[in-house]
Interface confidence: low
């Protein structure tokens, strides 16, 4: 028996599901008796779910996850995952015996959109040409961690004294905080842009400073 | 059926530190999440802060903040907290805790037996 | 912080007692509360989960209810192991909080 599987990883984003695609190839007058599936995780081989005996034996994983039955006897082995959680994330082997066997492991990314960035400036009033401030660019509930870029309005990177933070809460999706603090010209718009690198999603923040009032 | 084994009981002087370890069995040690969590004399139950191996991520409670380090060991299935510049009011028994599974971070089904851990010169 | 205050801090009853205990947040927590139990020198015990999920193994007689800011414990008819102390535990957001415990004597 060949089981194959996609080569690529699989995205799929937080708390949607997704399918980790695994097939083989039936013989003729070939019986679901015969076939043993499991799945595991690559690394710590755990039971993720399985289907012996002539029957599912079901989800040995947090019961999210689920096979084809209609669809194993052609050969379909793929696992459905349910609501996708950051911990999800990694390898999983698909292991096919029937007369003899072979296994094949597929890759899970998992990843979350960030929000849109919000802006805060310190100090927020009386500012003057040559005043330092402190910008700050809050993105939440993302993953994996982000790319934080700031630009000028020009479009043009602002690489001076730039502080940036990630911290996950309980479900591994990070808060990111990015502090700029820059010297004020007459007056400019600074730009902070959010990146995740899987989804390749980018999140925008800008704040325009004209004197006064400052627009968000 | 989770297990969780800590350390034994220690005696520290004020301003030293403490590594209590906590040895996980019956479980799949990387994806699920161990908290610390302390119990002065008398007193109620304070949660520190949680490590979750997997993610090789650790939060903390802002009061513990500095002072602690939550690490785990992936190999040995061991977490482990250590507490710095320890003062009288650290004199607590010191629990680890955890849900079981990926999916329970935040209630806690399994606890170690607990660390008494008395500061004192 | 999210802040539990628990009432009352003591209660004496007596064995086949219907007890009460509150729990009551300062913020609103949706339904992302835990009961425990626990008797001197042993670690807590999970009773409830969610509110008012009751944890596997848990006797039918402790249940779970409220949501937002204000929530109830009760033990329908109090039996000589359920003498210990009680704490509430929110999961809402980091940190972790626990209340500051009920104790049930004997009356």
């Known amino acids: 028996v060949e089981v194959q599987v996609s080569e690529d990883p699989v995205v799929a984003l937080v708390d949607t599901d997704a399918t980790l695609r695994c097939s083989f190839s039936p013989e003729p007058g070939f019986s679901l008796r015969q076939l043993n599936l499991i799945w595991q995780l690559t690394d710590t081989k755990q039971l993720v779910h399985s289907f012996t005996e002539g029957r599912d034996q079901g989800s040995a994983y947090a019961n999210r996850t689920a096979l084809f039955p209609d669809l194993l006897v052609q050969g379909n082995a793929s696992l459905r995952l349910q609501r996708v959680r950051v911990t999800d994330e990694g390898s999983y082997t698909c292991f096919v015996s029937i007369q003899d066997f072979d296994s094949a492991a597929v890759s899970l990314q998992v990843a979350a959109p960030y929000s849109k960035p919000s802006m805060t400036l310190e100090p927020n009033k009386d500012l003057r040409p040559g005043d330092m401030v402190t910008i700050t660019c809050s993105s939440y509930q993302g993953y994996p961690e982000a790319e934080v870029f700031w630009k000028d309005g020009q479009g043009l990177p602002l690489t001076g004294n730039v502080t940036t933070s990630q911290m996950a809460n309980e479900r591994g999706l990070f808060d990111v905080h990015s502090v700029l603090r820059v010297v004020l010209g007459a007056n400019g718009t600074y730009s902070c842009l959010v990146r995740n690198p899987v989804l390749q999603q980018d999140a925008h923040g800008s704040v325009t400073i004209t004197g006064q009032p400052m627009t968000f | 059926q989770v297990q969780l084994v800590e350390s034994g009981a220690e005696v520290k002087k004020p301003g030293s530190s403490v590594k209590v370890s906590c040895k996980a069995s019956g479980g799949t040690f990387s994806s699920y999440a161990i908290s610390w969590v302390r119990q002065a004399p008398g007193q109620g139950l304070e949660w520190m802060g949680r490590?979750?191996?997997?993610?090789?991520?650790?939060n903390y409670a802002q009061k513990f903040q500095g002072r602690v380090t939550i690490t785990a060991d992936k190999s040995t299935s061991t977490a482990y907290m250590e507490l710095s510049s320890l003062r009288s009011e650290d004199t607590a028994v010191y629990y680890c805790a955890n849900g079981g599974d990926s999916s329970s971070w935040y209630t806690f089904d399994y606890w170690g037996q607990g660390t008494l851990i008395t500061v004192s010169s | 912080d999210i802040q539990m205050t628990q009432s009352p801090s003591t209660l004496s009853a007596s064995v086949g007692d219907r007890v009460t205990i509150t729990c009551r947040a300062s913020q609103s927590i949706d339904n992302w509360l835990a009961w425990y139990q626990q008797k001197p020198g042993k670690a807590p015990k999970l009773l409830i989960y969610k509110a008012s999920s009751l944890q596997s193994g848990v006797p039918s007689r402790f249940s779970g209810s409220g949501s937002g800011t204000e929530f109830t414990l009760t033990i329908s008819s109090l039996q000589p192991d359920d003498f210990a102390s009680y704490y509430c535990?929110?999961?809402?957001?980091?940190?972790?909080?626990f209340g500051g415990g009920t104790k049930v004597e004997i009356k």
């Open positions: 490590i979750i191996p997997i993610l090789g991520i650790a």
């Open positions: 535990q929110q999961y809402d957001s980091n940190p972790l909080t």
